[in-house]
């Protein structure tokens, strides 16, 4: 081949260095963004997926840009603007990252964005047959109207005192508020 650095074989600003052995008369040290034995190939820098969190990669030749999705920022979209870092979920809740916004997975009995609100266990009117629902530290309790029993006042009490349950739970009286 006989090509040497004197022939200017390195393209795109590549630096030519004379080879250390007869089989390689020169070596091209390519600038960022180019590759190949003569720096003739442009590197598709976006193929390395440098933009995190779903950011769009733009190879501008002289530079690489990331267009970030909502909720993310930084040269490589690496900063979650609303992530769990430094953000606490109250009342035993755990923080879950995703989609550019943090979310709290709340412990039983709590709700809201940061688990600061007490959940309303009575919202769905769980106490049947006129039962009165109370929010309770253990969840909810139903005060059953006379003639009904069960955790949700779902079982009628028969006139003879028996209920529609196969067997009445121990220690419960018909009409008792149930946990």
């Amino acid at each position: 081949s006989g090509v040497t650095c004197a022939d200017g074989p390195c393209f795109n600003g590549g630096l030519c260095v004379g080879g250390a052995d007869p089989d390689s008369a020169y070596i091209c040290h390519c600038p960022p963004g180019f590759q190949g034995s003569n720096c003739e190939k442009r590197v598709d820098r976006c193929s390395l997926q440098p933009c995190r969190n779903g950011g769009l990669c733009l190879d501008l030749g002289h530079a690489l840009r990331c267009r970030c999705r909502a909720g993310f920022a930084g040269p490589r979209c690496e900063h979650d603007l609303d992530d769990c870092a430094g953000r606490a979920c109250a009342n035993g809740g755990t923080c879950v990252e995703g989609g550019g916004a943090h979310r709290c997975s709340c412990a039983l009995g709590f709700g809201g964005r940061d688990c600061r609100e007490r959940a309303d266990p009575c919202a769905a009117r769980p106490c049947a047959h006129g039962g009165r629902c109370y929010a309770h530290f253990s969840g909810l309790v139903c005060a059953c109207a006379p003639g009904y029993m069960g955790a949700r006042c779902e079982f009628p009490v028969h006139p003879d005192g028996a209920s529609a349950l196969p067997a009445a739970p121990p220690g419960l009286r018909p009409g008792d508020p149930q946990r």
Epitope: E117, R118, D120, P121, C122, A123, A124, R125, G130, R132, C133, Y134, A135, H136, V141, A143, A145, P146, R173, G175, D176, P177
Partner: antibody, heavy 123, light 111 residues
């Protein structure tokens, strides 16, 4: 510190209307049982009026005599109102807001009261 | 439903005992859903006893509730001047809906 404060009382003419407000601090209604109104005519005994669920169900209970003229509603997680219409001299009383909690399988336990607001119906 | 309290007023000396009766025209909910309140002039009522015989938080054991169904009693022993007040019983009922009624009140005078 858990507290209830009533407001909106005052002088109103017979057949007039008035809305009383109960505001809670130190707790939110959704974490408690029911919020209720009780009244007391000057020198007389206590008279239960109505209750509303502290949660979002909005379930209500009324004394028979109060149905139609009195309306209880929850306007936020810390405020409850009592709307009173067609007022008569007999409605002159101090109106108390009270919290009804479930304790040991019993209900209508008024364990927290406001100081009351005086409503005077007079021409 | 009517709750009748007797007697009124009731009077006793410091250190003495008073007993107030509350008679319901029909059984209260669960036979025990009856509460007692203490009210002093210019103040809201204060819950003393719930579930007929259970002492509310912070209430001294000198106050004792008893009874079931339609007949209930509040006993105050070792009377103190601070016990001078009006006492109300309150019953809960269910009949096509929940409701509550108060007794007429009993004034306790401490001599």
């Amino acid at each position: 510190q858990e507290q209830l404060v009533e407001s909106g009382g005052g002088l109103v003419q017979p057949e007039g209307s008035l809305t009383l407000t109960c505001t809670a601090s130190g707790f939110s209604f959704s974490s408690s049982g029911y919020m209720c109104w009780v009244r007391q005519a000057p020198g007389k005994g206590l008279e239960w009026i109505a209750c509303i669920s502290g949660g979002s169900s909005g379930d209500t209970d009324y004394a028979n005599w109060a149905k139609g003229r009195f309306s209880i509603s929850k306007t936020s997680s810390t405020t409850v109102t009592l709307q009173m219409t067609s007022l008569t001299v007999a409605d002159t009383a101090t109106y108390f807001c009270a919290r009804d909690v479930y304790i040991d399988s019993t209900i209508f336990n008024f364990n927290l009261w406001g100081p009351g607001t005086l409503v005077t119906v007079s021409s | 439903q009517v709750l009748t309290q007797t007697p009124s007023p009731v009077s006793a000396a410091v250190g003495g005992t008073v007993t107030i009766s509350c008679q319901a025209s029909q059984s209260v909910y669960n036979n025990n859903n009856l509460a007692w309140y203490q009210q002093k002039p210019g103040q809201p009522p204060k819950l003393l006893i719930y579930a007929a015989s259970s002492l509310a938080s912070g209430v001294p054991s000198r106050f004792k509730g008893s009874g079931a169904g339609t007949q209930f009693t509040l006993t105050i022993s070792d009377l103190e001047c601070d016990d001078a007040a009006t006492y109300y019983c309150q019953g809960t009922y269910y009949s096509s809906g929940w409701y509550s009624t108060f007794g007429g009140g009993t004034e306790v005078v401490v001599k």
